[in-house]
């Protein structure tokens, strides 16, 4: 995300179109309190950050309240009055959607439909991952609404599920982040379970003739 400008690496995350977090890693200024200055309009004066993130006692980032802002963030990271990194970027392309809420499971024989509340903005993928203790890795299915039907499940097996939301790269570009995963929930025979057995009984070996 942030190439080096005077050795400064930056990362921007826009949490659910609510809060922007800009962090920096500047080896050249590792013992320095760099300051963060920003504006949402190219014609305004810069404001200084009022909510710094600290690492080992020095500034390492800034949190900005940016509820539903879809404009350009102009910012400057400074060592005193000297800018060490200056840029202006569309914030929406650093989107990290919120974790899926109100996740529900609707079972019908060998299939389950996973639903959750759709987020208010578009061009998202809702991804469900699932596995049984017999699976070596997670299986995945995704749709562009939070209504994902997974078929061909074995009603006798216990399955773990979790859900996340991703911005479509084709539309949002390469700098977005998937949401955090929802909590894992476990199901067997259409009923919720506390957990699925981690180590299933291994299949009996076939006797060679």
């Amino acid at each position: 995300q942030g190439g080096a400008a005077e050795g400064v690496q930056i990362q921007i995350i826009y949490f659910n179109l609510e809060t922007v977090q800009v962090t920096w890693n500047a080896s050249k200024y590792s013992r320095t309190n760099l300051t963060f200055h920003y504006r949402f309009n190219g014609d305004e004066a810069y404001d200084q950050c009022t909510n710094y993130l600290l690492q080992e006692g020095h500034t390492s980032g800034c949190l900005l309240d940016a509820e539903q802002r879809d404009d350009i963030l102009y910012f400057s990271i400074r060592n005193g009055t000297h800018p060490v990194f200056t840029a202006s970027r569309w914030m929406v392309y650093y989107l990290k959607p919120s974790s899926p809420k109100h996740v529900r499971f609707s079972w019908h024989q060998d299939a389950v439909t996973v639903t959750c509340s759709d987020l208010s903005y578009g061009d998202l993928l809702y991804e469900v991952q699932y596995r049984s203790p017999f699976d070596t890795e997670w299986q995945s299915k995704q749709e562009n609404t939070c209504n994902v039907t997974i078929e061909g499940l074995d009603a006798e097996k216990c399955y773990s599920f979790w859900v996340r939301v991703k911005a479509m790269e084709d539309v949002y570009g390469p700098d977005t982040y998937p949401s955090d995963w929802s909590e894992v929930t476990c199901w067997q025979r259409g009923e919720i379970r506390d957990a699925c057995a981690e180590t299933p009984t291994p299949p009996k070996p076939k006797l060679s003739k």
Partner: antibody, heavy 117, light 107 residues
């Protein structure tokens, strides 16, 4: 599939006005910034204007400030450029473009605006 | 505003040649640089974004490199369909700006 289709270019007298549009499909139009870029015949590409997804923030190149207005109608998935006080040097092909912070992948086919003096 | 200077402005080459185009920025732009190909009467086509990432569907003979102020577009083996004009664009800071273009012509 994302598509951008411009319409409304044409011949206009110097000092006159023209509005043209860009119809978008294949993505959630209201969630994304949009851009206008122009190209004078035989010359290079030149950014003209950008607008935020909601339409609440607009940005202009210095050479069009006060003369051009970018706008959008999210209910119609359409982007507009209103051009006033046109000059001969505004003669160009105008493109709408959609991208992200790293590059603009989607472009309209372009619409030619000719300003006669 | 950030100025981008492309060199050369004009380049004559033959099919099979290795071609390199340079784009220099007047100040650091991290890796926020894109490369476009444009043919007469057509809209620009995105080839490379984020300085070095190949856009899907673009042949692998195209590659981009660089960071900060100096960037290059390389065509490893020029094909007949590659004769066109190429532009760099910076998106690090508004306003976005383009290089003046490099026309690649048949020798």
């Amino acid at each position: 599939e994302v598509q951008l289709v411009e319409s409304g270019g044409g011949l206009v007298q110097s000092g006159g006005s023209l509005r043209f549009s860009c119809a978008a499909s294949g993505f959630t139009f209201s969630s994304h910034p949009m851009n206008w870029v122009r190209q004078v015949p035989g010359k290079g590409l030149e950014w003209v204007s950008s607008i935020s997804g909601s339409g609440g923030s607009t940005y202009y190149a210095d050479f069009v400030k006060g003369r051009f207005t970018i706008s959008r109608d999210n209910s119609k998935n359409t982007l507009y450029l209103q051009m006033n006080s046109l000059r001969a040097e505004d003669t160009a092909v105008y493109y709408c473009a959609k991208g992200h912070n790293s590059g603009w992948k989607y472009w309209g086919q372009g619409t030619l605006v000719t300003v006669s003096s | 505003d950030i100025q981008l200077t492309q060199s050369p402005s004009f380049l004559s080459a033959s099919v099979g040649d290795r071609v390199t185009i340079t784009c220099r920025a007047s100040q650091g732009i991290s890796s926020y640089l894109a490369w476009y190909q444009q043919k007469p009467g057509k809209a620009p086509k995105l080839l490379i974004y984020a300085a070095s990432t190949l856009q899907s569907g673009v042949p692998s003979r195209f590659s981009g490199s660089g960071s900060g102020t100096e960037f290059t577009l390389t065509i490893s083996s020029l094909q007949p369909e590659d004769f066109a004009t190429y532009y760099c664009q910076q998106l690090n800071s508004y306003p976005p700006t383009f290089g003046q273009g490099t026309k690649v012509d048949i020798k």
